[in-house]
Interface confidence: medium
Amino acid sequence: TPEVWVQVQMEATELSSFTVHCGFLGPGSISLVTVSWGGPDGAGGTKLAVLHPELGTRQWAPARQARWETQSSISLALEDSGASSPFANTTFCCKFASFPEGSWESCGSLPPSSDPGLSAPPTPVPILRAD
């Protein structure tokens, strides 16, 4: 069964900067990756970025840069402009649409006790939505 992993990482140098890493474990080619926060895409979450292997990427504030790391993983840099750190308690979700498997989505957040520079383990916590 395909699996999606999500890591949320606070940058050690900039406490207002976070990076979300997501990856797809499984066969098939990825046709679209959607990163959202506050919940799954289309289920209360808000899109932060979409990455298409041919059409490039689109990201929206507070996302700073979305990019492919490998053919099956992406990273999204986030800039927290506020004085407080809302990202710390936020859920980030990554949805991978692949052919022929369909869509697989997983969510993760920064662990409550995270030290800067430490990241959450790659917890798949799959949301059972294989469209």
């Epitope: 808000t46 979409v50 298409h52 041919e54 689109r58 996302a63």
Partner: antibody, heavy 120, light 107 residues
Framework: QVQLQQSGPELARPGASVKLSCKAS????????ISWVKQRTGQGLEWIGE????????YYSEKFKGKATLTADKSSNIAYMQLSSLTSEDSAVYFC?????????????WGQGTSVTVSS | DIVMTQSQKCMSTSVGDRVSITCKAS??????VAWYQQKPGQSPKTLIY???NRHTGVPDRFTGSGSGTDFTLTITNVQSEDLADYFC?????????FGGGTELEIK
Amino acid sequence: QVQLQQSGPELARPGASVKLSCKASGYTLTSHGISWVKQRTGQGLEWIGEIYPGSESPYYSEKFKGKATLTADKSSNIAYMQLSSLTSEDSAVYFCARSDYSDYWAMDYWGQGTSVTVSS
Amino acid sequence: DIVMTQSQKCMSTSVGDRVSITCKASQNVRSAVAWYQQKPGQSPKTLIYLASNRHTGVPDRFTGSGSGTDFTLTITNVQSEDLADYFCLQHWNYPWTFGGGTELEIK
């Protein structure tokens, strides 16, 4: 079904501002972008910019920076475009259109348009 | 900005004919091109997305093709209701840009 309902025609004086609205139904505003497009009488289409209401982070075509301001009210599913310091060059029909980032990566559904006439 | 050129400003055709409307991008836009139809006094309607995919409800006599810099919208078995302006759009790079439009006239 997806529908975008735009506000009625506007008649404004040079130098004034107008605020056009675009009410989305049949989907959640925050799941898609909203683009705005200008069309002067008998002319082609000009892309003004796009707002992704989930993030309130508009992108403007250079030509419309300072002229158009795009906002959205997520609770009422309405997108807005304010046009400021109006001149006769701003007389046109303005369309809102939904930008889809799942399948289309472009505008898929369009509003009926709002006519803006600038005249003294 | 990417310039989209529709060299034919107006094309004349007859009912039942086949017509091809072309659009050329000033740089490679992959398959990030959409085609829109605008009938007189109406708002634009989406015909084709991602160069070759028909929008919901669009008759199969409308076909999009091309990638890179050269794109074509082909209408086979032209109907009188196809009288309209046709615009291409590139959405590879912001700002998105439209072609100047091609008016289809039915003889």
